[in-house]
């Protein structure tokens, strides 16, 4: 269990002449919203698709009205975070999305108007725990700065927030190698913080800074095993009975990393994720200033030069971690379109492209529109190895070489009036006649037989769908 | 595709109530907006109440303020007007209708509503 947040820090113009001086149209003042979906994975969602793993609402922002002469202010936005509980495991990969709505606060025809000023989408990696991620985002003429971090709650720790802390009332009954089957009692409440490196499985702390073992092991950091054994000469051979789990030796049981350095484990091995400070295959080496070039993979290293003070490595593309020590799996994003193969040559992504599809993502099909043009201001639309011409109004044809007239073809029923719209045609149905072609009567009654489409305007009011 | 059905039409007497319900399925996430509307014989369609599903705001018509009522269920994936003290000039066809939003959705403008039930009954007589 944990809560992920999201801080907006501004949301305003983007740079570049195109850009709006104000989020309010020129009806009058407006209030912005901002609302947060999170999808698991980093595949590419449906933007209609659930926000599995939750959603969250700002709170509304304060009224904006712009002032003509004024030079555009910063806009007044919703106080506080924005904050998605989640109930199970954090999934690590997940996709973001930002939605910025615009309320109009003045009286107007048709009622207040709502409008989605902008929507960014990010897919992204973040471990549980870390550090506050900073991220700026431009969608359309708008520009969106945000942090967001995700946190374990209750008593969850971890990466995923899957392990589950210790009672303060510790020691537990359980042996060694074995902990107390969720869920904890009501009793247990988050435990302080212990001496770095103390193992989160073995060992626990009444005050902050000490490491105090479980039965059943021992050691400064409670990493090693001791003989002894609570869970064994109860009732029943299983383990079961006794209220007690045996997790199977794992590469990051016991936590091999030190000076708080957190495990995750890789097949067959472990990987040790160091703070700033630290280095080495199990966060074992310190008091690192940027003079013992700690830096791996040509990044750049940046602090004093005295034993105090820390380093931070800027990393080039391709490469993460403290110590620039983690290659990004940049393929993971799936950057190649139409099913080309990703190849990360460390310099550089390449895609292999299947046959037929050409470009450095793979999103030009060959096959279709090269050398192929559609007359009289038609595009020409890809897909399926054949192209298409989607035409301007009022052409049509394979090539939109030949004149069309939506209305030739007198497809408004029961005396319909006609109109070419530019985007197909529109039918201004005859009184007693409604439907998207007046095909249905109205009866006396005020009662019609009409499909799941809406009804037919009155004369003189053209529908806006098709 | 979103689809819309009305139920909970009828005759009523005038200074009566009833509760019109609307279940919609499909792509319901999209539905950022859902309303009912009214068109009466020879009338055009009107925006009686619309919600905005995910922040709880709600639009009246000046016609029935203080006497309608909309809210929703989002388990359910329904929306509910509650009529009282019903009108005759209230008899007319109710339609319950969706929209998502890229531009400009303004809450009683049946023009910018994209998905439409078949419509409900309602007649009050004096």
């Known amino acids: 269990a944990g809560v992920f947040e999201l801080q907006i820090h501004s949301f305003g113009p983007g740079p570049g002449p195109g850009a709006p001086r104000s989020p309010c149209s020129a009806r009058g003042p407006c209030r912005l919203f901002f609302r947060v979906c999170l999808k698991p994975g980093l595949s590419e969602e449906a933007a209609e698709s659930p926000c599995a793993l939750g959603a969250a609402l700002s709170a509304r922002g304060p009224v904006y009205t712009e002032q003509p002469e004024a030079p555009a202010p910063d806009l007044p936005l919703p106080n506080g975070l924005l904050q998605v509980p989640f109930r199970d495991a954090w999934p690590g990969t997940f996709s973001l999305i930002i939605e910025t709505w615009r309320e109009e606060l003045g009286d107007q025809i048709g009622g207040p108007a709502w409008s989605l000023l902008a929507r960014v989408t990010r897919r992204r990696r973040l471990a549980a725990g870390g550090p506050w991620a900073r991220d700026i985002q431009r969608a359309g003429a708008w520009e969106l700065r945000f942090s967001y971090r995700a946190r374990c709650e209750l008593l969850a720790v971890g990466t995923a927030c899957t392990r589950l802390c210790r009672p303060r009332s510790a020691p537990s009954r359980c042996g060694p190698g074995l902990r107390p089957c969720a869920p904890l009692e009501d009793e247990c409440e988050a435990p302080p913080v212990c001496r770095a490196g103390c193992s989160l499985e073995h060992g626990f702390c009444e005050q902050p800074g000490e490491c105090r073992c479980l039965e059943g092991w021992t050691g400064p950091l409670c990493t090693v095993p001791a003989s002894t054994s609570s869970c064994l000469g109860l009732r029943g051979p299983s383990s079961a009975t006794t209220g007690c789990l045996v997790p199977g030796p794992g590469p990051c049981d016991g936590n091999p990393c030190a000076n708080g350095g957190s495990c995750s484990e890789t097949p067959g091995s472990f990987e040790c994720t160091c703070p700033r400070g630290f280095y080495g295959l199990r966060c074992e080496v310190s008091g690192v200033t940027c003079a013992d070039g700690p830096c791996f993979n040509g990044g750049l290293c940046v602090g004093g030069a005295d034993p105090d003070s820390a380093y931070i490595c800027h990393c080039p593309p391709g490469f993460q971690g403290s110590n620039c020590e983690k290659r990004v799996d940049r393929c993971s994003l799936q950057p190649c379109r139409n099913g080309g193969l990703c190849l990360d040559l460390g310099h550089a992504l390449r895609c292999r492209c299947r046959a037929g599809f050409a470009g450095p993502r793979c999103e030009h099909n060959l096959d279709d529109c090269a050398g192929r043009a559609c007359a009289n201001g038609g595009t020409c639309v890809e897909g399926g190895g054949a192209h298409r011409c989607s035409c301007a109004l009022g052409f049509g044809g394979r090539d939109c070489r030949e004149r069309a007239d939506p209305c030739a073809a007198r497809p408004c029923a029961h005396g319909g009036r006609c109109y070419a719209h530019f985007s197909g045609l529109v039918c201004a149905c005859a009184p007693g006649y409604m439907g998207s072609r007046c095909e249905f009567p109205v009866h006396p009654d005020g009662v019609s037989a009409l499909p799941a489409a809406p009804p037919g305007l009155r004369p003189g009011d053209p529908q806006r769908y098709l | 595709q979103v689809r819309l059905v009305e139920s909970g039409g009828g005759s009523v007497q005038a200074g009566g109530s009833l509760r019109l319900s609307c279940a919609a399925s499909?792509?319901?996430?999209?539905?950022?907006?859902m309303g009912w509307f009214r068109q009466a014989p020879g009338k055009e369609r009107e925006g009686v109440a619309t919600l905005v599903t995910w922040v709880e705001r709600t639009a009246y018509a000046d016609s029935v303020k203080g006497r309608f009522t909309i809210s929703q269920d989002r388990a359910k994936n329904t929306v509910y007007l509650q009529m009282n003290s019903l009108k005759p000039e209230d008899t007319a066809m109710y339609y319950c209708?969706?929209?998502?939003?890229?531009?400009?959705?303004?809450?009683?403008?049946?023009?910018?509503?994209?998905?439409w039930g078949q419509g409900t009954q309602v007649t009050v007589s004096s």
């Open positions: 209708a969706a929209a998502a939003a890229s531009t400009d959705v303004r809450l009683l403008d049946p023009g910018d509503f994209a998905y």
């Open positions: 499909g792509s319901t996430y999209s539905t950022n907006f």
